[in-house]
Interface confidence: low
């Protein structure tokens, strides 16, 4: 003689967070008469998920109409699944009794695993800017994913990076997990337009990884090179001296002209020209009245770039010499910020 069996045909069910989990349970017989209850876990500490007979279970709906006498399908749907719902669910048949119903038979259980998508990766760079040739660290964080298996990759301008360390927490079992990775990136002068990308791949993303980006323009400081040049005479007794400020980033830059150590003029770079690599160029000029000087004049172009210590370049103007164009000096390198062309 056949006895009622409680069949939970799905050994495991995998559901994405936010979706609905369907837990199948079928009784092979209509007798004995009595309700079905669903529990998460087994033993005395099990949690009641659904009781056919009584109670309010707002997240649970039944697949079929349990009010029908001939119903054998006791499958349920649990809505808006979160990682906290993971566990093994048991469908339990009770036999009608007095005063209480008596547990008759349990299904083998269905393990509900919740797939939760990782949050969008957030990439953070260093607090302070750094100059080319220096190594800076970027961090990438993503949270709330399940299962634990996840892949994280770093790229700079499409090229995969290898110098990084990644941790997934917690180490043990959890309803959801977080990932934290730190990558080291060596800056170059051409990195103003560069991007660092953190890419996270997870089973929930169906082959379409999430990406977080950081622009190196927020991280890099390219110091300017200076060149002071004496231009041809503009008029009798006047010499035009220019200071070329080249290849700097960011734009924040202040330039001061000194004549024999005395401040002649200070200006802030505003109208600048941009190079293809994202750095800026700026030129400032100073018109020197030679007749006002008896002795030779030391002209100094002093640049303060992005709050860094000033760098300078000097040019000696010989007042006794015939005002012909003099050669340019070698550029001095320094850190820089803003710039403008002033004519």
């Amino acid at each position: 003689e056949e006895e009622l069996q409680v069949i939970q045909p799905d050994k495991s069910v995998l559901v994405a967070a936010g979706e609905t989990a369907t837990l199948r349970c079928t009784a092979t017989s209509l007798i004995p008469v009595g309700p079905i209850q669903w529990f998460r876990g087994a033993g005395p500490g099990r949690e009641l998920i659904y009781n056919q007979k009584e109670g309010h279970f707002p997240r649970v709906t039944t697949v079929s109409d349990l009010t029908k006498r001939n119903n054998m399908d006791f499958s349920i749907r649990i809505g808006n699944i979160t990682p906290a719902d993971a566990g093994t669910y048991y469908c339990v048949k009770f036999r009608k009794g007095s005063p209480d119903d008596v547990e008759f038979k349990s299904g083998a259980g269905t393990e509900l695993s919740v797939r939760a998508k990782p949050s969008a990766p957030v990439v953070s760079g260093p607090a302070a800017r750094a100059t080319p040739q220096h190594t800076v660290s970027f961090t990438c964080e993503s949270h709330g994913f399940s299962p634990r298996d996840i892949t994280l990759k770093w790229f700079k301008n499409g090229n995969e990076l290898s110098d990084f360390q990644t941790n997934v927490d917690p180490v043990g079992e959890s309803v959801s997990y977080s990932i934290h990775s730190t990558a080291k990136v060596v800056l170059t002068r051409e990195d103003v337009h560069s991007q660092v990308i953190c890419e996270v791949a997870h089973v929930t993303l169906q082959g379409d990884p999430l990406r977080g980006t950081a622009n190196l323009s927020e991280t890099i400081r390219v110091p300017p090179t200076l060149e002071v040049t004496q231009q041809p005479v503009r008029a009798e007794n006047q010499v035009n001296v220019t200071c070329q400020v080249r290849k700097f980033y960011p734009q924040r830059l202040q330039l001061t002209w000194l004549e024999n150590g005395n401040v002649s003029r200070t200006e802030t770079a505003s109208t600048v020209t941009e190079n293809k690599d994202g750095t800026y160029n700026w030129m400032s000029w100073l018109l020197v009245n030679v007749s006002a000087h008896r002795d030779d004049v030391k002209l100094t172009c002093q640049v303060e770039h992005d709050g860094q210590p000033a760098v300078s370049k000097s040019h000696d103007l010989k007042v006794s010499a015939h005002p012909k164009e003099q050669g340019s000096n070698t550029a001095a390198e320094n850190t820089g910020s803003n710039e403008r062309n002033i004519y």
Partner: antibody, heavy 122, light 107 residues
Framework: QVQLVESGGGVVQPGRSLRLSCAAS????????MHWVRQAPGKGLEWVAV????????IYADSVKGRFTISRDNSKNTLYLQMNSLRAEDTAVYYC???????????????WGQGTMVTVSS | DIQMTQSPSSLSASVGDRVTITCQAS??????LNWYQQKPGKAPKLLIY???NLETGVPSRFSGSGSGTDFTFTISSLQPEDIATYYC?????????FGGGTKVEIK
């Protein structure tokens, strides 16, 4: 490659017995419920029986209940259908089938064998 | 058992035609309905699951819709390789039951 291969079909006289086998490969056999579905010549499809992943639960169509027994040997990745007291109306191609876990319920048959023909005739 | 009534039992259409097959369940089966294609001498092949979801690798000209008791299977543009018999199948209740099939031929 996921594969189900049936064997054991043939011609048998009414009242006699026959045992069908279904060899599974390419997937974790022990994690899936397994089914037998049949198709009489020129007719439609009829579900016959299901067995739970661990063999503890078995359900049969009314038309075969008491005559057919479904079983499995997970160590051999093999499903069986023992057919006793065969009748002429049992003549059909017998397919074993299973489902992919992506289906919430266990009765969407996305993996089928090629079928084995059972002819019950005197 | 849930009775699945499929219609028509056969149809003939031209290449490129839109073909529609209906399946009616004897009671509400939610959206737990599959559609299969079976070519002569071959095992059935799952095309649509859960009433409207296209099985991986199945051409997008096949589609399904419906919920409750009434379901529709559509081939948007019939191709010569679509000559086959198509079956609906419910799996809300045991036993799972199939429709009688629709044989699709080319004019």
């Amino acid at each position: 490659q996921v594969q189900l291969v049936e064997s054991g079909g043939g011609v048998v006289q009414p009242g006699r017995s026959l045992r069908l086998s279904c060899a599974a490969s390419g997937f974790t056999f022990s994690s899936y419920g397994m089914h037998w579905v049949r198709q009489a010549p020129g007719k439609g499809l009829e579900w016959v029986a299901v067995i739970a992943y661990d063999g503890s639960n078995k359900i049969y169509a009314d038309s075969v209940k008491g005559r057919f027994t479904i079983s499995r040997d997970n160590s051999k990745n093999t499903l069986y259908l023992q057919m006793n007291s065969l009748r002429a109306e049992d003549t059909a191609v017998y397919y074993c089938a299973t489902t992919d876990t992506k289906y919430t319920l266990g009765f969407a048959f996305d993996i089928w064998g090629q079928g084995t023909m059972v002819t019950v005739s005197s | 058992d849930i009775q699945m009534t499929q219609s028509p039992s056969s149809l003939s259409a031209s290449v490129g035609d839109r073909v529609t097959i209906t399946c009616q369940a004897s009671q509400d089966i939610s959206n737990y309905l599959n559609w299969y294609q079976q070519k002569p001498g071959k095992a059935p092949k799952l095309l649509i699951y859960d009433a409207s979801n296209l099985e991986t690798g199945v051409p997008s000209r096949f589609s399904g819709s419906g919920s409750g008791t009434d379901f529709t299977f559509t081939i948007s543009s019939l191709q010569p390789e679509d000559i086959a018999t198509y079956y609906c199948q419910q799996f809300t209740y045991l036993p799972p039951t199939f429709g009688g099939g629709t044989k699709v031929e080319i004019k």
